[in-house]
């Protein structure tokens, strides 16, 4: 039975040209996290294997940096980066947990962080 929950940074906004940290945290389970994948819509941005480390997709290596922790840093943001991002936790023995973050990249300087929320 999957008992864990993923807490994410929720709906967030950031300024064009700036950076943003995408963060997820898995709690309420003793399952072993074996790998965390970061995806944007249908594209794989990065893999963080618990033993074998971080691997950034060549398509994103210039604008994506690993961390902090299991999070992901997006740099040099453009309005095209607006959209859904997913953290996918591969765990043993529970299976897969998925968290969702919506990022809006704004032209102006009115970007503010949204509230945290949980996905079971």
């Amino acid at each position: 039975m999957m008992t864990g929950t993923i807490e994410t940074t929720g709906n967030i906004s950031a300024e064009k040209g700036g950076s943003i940290i995408l963060q997820c945290h898995l709690s309420s389970t003793t399952a072993q996290v074996t790998q965390v994948n970061w995806e944007q819509q249908d594209q794989l941005l990065a893999i963080c294997n618990a033993d074998l480390g971080w691997h950034i997709s060549p398509s994103f290596k210039d604008r994506v940096a690993p961390g902090p922790g299991l999070g992901l840093t997006l740099q040099s943001l453009t309005v095209n980066d607006t959209g859904e991002y997913f953290c996918i936790y591969h765990t043993y023995p529970d299976g897969t947990y998925t968290g969702r973050i919506f990022l809006e990249v704004l032209e102006s300087s009115v970007a503010e962080h949204g509230a945290r929320f949980q996905i079971p």
Partner: antibody
Framework: QVQLQESGGGLVQPGGSLRLSCAAS????????MSWVRQNPDKRLELVAT????????YYPDSVKGRFTISRDNAKNTLYLQMNSLRAEDTAMYYC????????????WGQGTLVTVSS | DIVMTQSPKTLSASVGDRVTITCKAS??????VSWYQQKPGQSPKLLIY???TRHTGVPDRFSGSGSGTDYTLTISSLQAEDVALYYC?????????FGGGTKVEIK
């Protein structure tokens, strides 16, 4: 250049134990996660164990979980695989492997050590 | 676990031929795929990672492509030294699993 040299293979009876070693050189061993990959007589490849750079995290597939233990001695630049309760289906060539730097794939492999489980 | 199904199991072609090996994943692996070559009596050698990035020193006659569940390794002009077993591997989900292999022979 990166070199990985396995040893410790041999013939063992079902239910027996064996400890494989992999001597690493040519890179900073303590900075890299390491893996054991085996190739059975039908030439199928299977990743059987991984360990992080400091030895604090390990992973095993269900096929070997509870029977195999991966460990490392960073002072000796050596990777180990302790194999207990061996079965006929564990018969394989065992390779020590390392990912390339910034490479999602095993760029470095040893020459392998053969483990035969038979009565 | 994700199952990687390679085809064909054996491929016989002439020197200079264009050769294609396919790998089908049991679920979307989003380009987290690598390809290896194993010559007789040798250890596997990395050819391609992230589905299409050629590893250092790999001849440019080797190329990889694909997305979703379907991936391809192409040898644009088969050479005698390309006789080997070829394997795909997925890194999308643990355990990282390999395909069953394709044996490439010269006609």
């Amino acid at each position: 250049q990166v070199q990985l040299q396995e040893s410790g293979g041999g013939l063992v009876q079902p239910g027996g134990s064996l400890r494989l070693s992999c001597a690493a050189s040519g890179f900073t061993f303590s900075s890299y996660g390491m893996s054991w990959v085996r190739q059975n007589p039908d030439k199928r490849l299977e990743l059987v164990a991984t360990i992080n750079s400091n030895g604090g995290s390990t992973y095993y597939p269900d096929s070997v979980k509870g029977r195999f233990t991966i460990s490392r001695d960073n002072a000796k630049n050596t990777l180990y695989l302790q194999m207990n309760s061996l079965r006929a289906e564990d018969t394989a060539m065992y390779y020590c492997a390392r990912l390339g730097t910034g490479t999602l794939g095993f760029a470095y492999w040893g020459q392998g050590t053969l483990v035969t489980v038979s009565s | 676990d994700i199952v990687m199904t390679q085809s064909p199991k054996t491929l016989s072609a002439s020197v200079g031929d264009r050769v294609t090996i396919t790998c089908k994943a049991s679920q979307d692996v989003k380009t987290a795929v690598s390809w290896y070559q194993q010559k007789p009596g040798q250890s596997p050698k990395l050819l391609i990672y992230w589905a299409s990035t050629r590893h250092t020193g790999v001849p440019d006659r080797f190329s990889g492509s694909g997305s979703g569940t379907d991936y391809t390794l192409t040898i644009s002009s088969l050479q005698a030294e390309d006789v080997a077993l070829y394997y795909c591997q997925q890194h999308y989900s643990t355990p990282w699993t390999f395909g069953g292999g394709t044996k490439v022979e010269i006609k």
